[in-house]
């Protein structure tokens, strides 16, 4: 802000003069600037116990410029507002208040949450996950041969991480027991990894052995993406008498 304080040079009528210094259009010895040159804003500057009129090219923090024909002034934002566009539209709130649609609020309205970094009320973001990827081949100790009972896994990705008040992410990993017809490992097949293990490593902090609650298990059974190829369906017939057990990872 470029400030100009007036000094009386030419007497116009008692206590008022023109031809002031800097940005003042009219001024007085006692009050400093009384009015400002075009495009400048009048403001009161406190000097000790006294307030002096000054002319500024832009208004200080906590004020906005009001323009009327040939008379501009710095006008105070509302008490809870740090910077504003006008009296009714705040652009930055004072500490302890959250900005929402130009207003400063103690608490954010229903359906919104406080972002303590930007000090704004923002929409609550719920977790979004992709559809399940296909089940991995049935494996045991990383091999797809030489056993009868093994496990198979499927995963899904987190598309949108939730905000503080958003719904938590559902499991992104599911593992269940599976049975295959025993077949001998061919030469070079020993220790062959399942396709899924090569394709995706567990997310950092994921526990492959975390067992979810029964609701998670039920929901995993109901997911329509559980498509299986014909070969897997044949294998599954052997399991009909056994209950399928799932192991999931929750985020």
């Amino acid at each position: 802000q470029n400030a100009s304080r007036g000094r009386r040079q030419r007497r116009m009528h008692p206590n008022v003069s023109q031809g002031c210094q800097g940005g003042c259009a009219t001024c007085s010895d006692y009050n400093g600037c009384l009015s400002c040159k075009p495009r400048l804003f009048f403001a009161l500057e406190r000097i000790g116990m006294k307030q002096i009129g000054v002319c500024l090219s832009s208004c200080p923090s906590g004020y906005y410029g009001t323009r009327y024909p040939d008379i501009n002034k710095c006008t105070k934002c509302k008490a809870d507002c740090d910077t504003c566009f006008n009296k009714n539209f705040c652009t930055k709130c004072k500490s302890g208040f959250y900005l929402h649609l130009g207003k400063c609020l103690d608490n954010c309205p229903e359906g919104l949450e406080a972002n303590n970094h930007t000090m704004e009320c923002v929409s609550i973001v719920h977790c979004e996950v992709s559809e399940w990827n296909p089940w991995s081949p049935c494996t045991k100790k990383g091999k797809t041969c030489g056993f009868k009972r093994g496990t198979e896994t499927r995963v899904r990705e987190i598309i949108q991480h939730p905000s503080a008040k958003g719904n938590l992410c559902p499991p992104t990993n599911e593992t269940r027991k599976c049975t295959v017809q025993r077949k001998k490992c061919q030469k070079g097949e020993r220790g062959k990894k399942g396709r899924e293990r090569k394709r995706k490593k567990p997310n950092k902090g994921e526990s492959k052995e975390a067992i979810p609650d029964s609701k998670s298990l039920e929901s995993s059974k109901e997911i329509p993406e559980q498509r299986e190829n014909k070969q897997q369906q044949k294998k599954r017939k052997v399991q009909d008498k056994q209950k399928s057990v799932s192991v999931s990872t929750v985020h």
Partner: antibody, heavy 119, light 107 residues
Framework: EVQLVESGPGLVKPSETLSLTCTVS????????WNWIRQPPGKGLEYMGY???????YQNPSLKSRITISRDTSKNQYSLKLSSVTAADTAVYYC?????????????WGQGTLVTVSS | DIQMTQSPSSLSASVGDRVTITCKAS??????LSWYQQKPGKAPKTLIY???RLVDGVPSRFSGSGSGQDYTLTISSLQPEDFATYYC?????????FGQGTKVEIK
């Protein structure tokens, strides 16, 4: 000493236009802000608007469609026109001046002129 | 528009009394407030501007104070010539608005 004197007809018929002039002495209307204020009998003061040193005007939105403020710098006068008047416009009309936010607001006033709206 | 609520609307006082008149703005007016004295049949006279600055020639028994939304005019020792109607005016933004007035009468 700055002096302001209002002049104009004291009686105006309803639906007609009220016209008043403020003649200024002791200062030029090419500096400062020149205002109109009115006061209905026995009531409070109402701000009407101003004409600035450059001739730009501001009108109170409550009167905006009816009010015109103009000036004649050669005579050092400024004028008020208020159209489509009704009995509610009966008031004492004052002209007054100020020089900016840092000084006395309405430092100088005219003596006022009563305008009655009646048929 | 900013509303100015002045109180009381009238008061009775004796010479020598201390008189206080208040004006409350509907929002913060940042000290842009003036006080006027009006006697019957006369134009208003400016007493105080910018909340507490006395106009040249106004007796020092008149004083103004306040900030934000609340402002006060005080007459420390009422004199016979002070019986009149007093108005506040905000000029923080346009349109300017006056208080409804306070009539100070002799008790």
């Amino acid at each position: 000493e700055v002096q302001l004197v209002e002049s104009g007809p004291g009686l105006v018929k309803p639906s007609e236009t009220l016209s008043l002039t403020c003649t200024v002495s002791g200062d030029s209307i090419t500096s400062g802000y020149w205002n109109w204020i009115r006061q209905p009998p026995g009531k409070g003061l109402e701000y009407m608007g101003y004409i600035s040193y450059s001739g730009k005007t501001y009108q109170n939105p409550s009167l905006k469609s009816r009010i015109t403020i103009s000036r004649d710098t050669s005579k050092n006068q400024y004028s008020l026109k208020l159209s489509s008047v009704t009995a509610a416009d009966t008031a004492v009309y004052y002209c007054a001046t100020y020089y900016g936010y840092g000084g006395p607001w309405f430092a100088y006033w005219g003596q006022g002129t009563l305008v009655t709206v009646s048929s | 528009d900013i509303q100015m609520t002045q109180s009381p609307s009238s008061l009775s006082a004796s010479v020598g009394d201390r008189v206080t008149i208040t004006c409350k703005a509907s929002q913060d007016i940042d000290s842009y407030l003036s006080w006027y004295q009006q006697k019957p049949g006369k134009a208003p006279k400016t007493l105080i501007y910018l909340t507490n600055r006395l106009v040249d020639g106004v007796p020092s028994r008149f004083s103004g104070s306040g900030s934000g939304q609340d402002y006060t005019l005080t007459i420390s020792s009422l004199q016979p010539e002070d019986f009149a109607t007093y108005y506040c005016l905000h000029y923080d933004e346009f349109p300017l608005t006056f208080g409804q007035g306070t009539k100070v009468e002799i008790k």
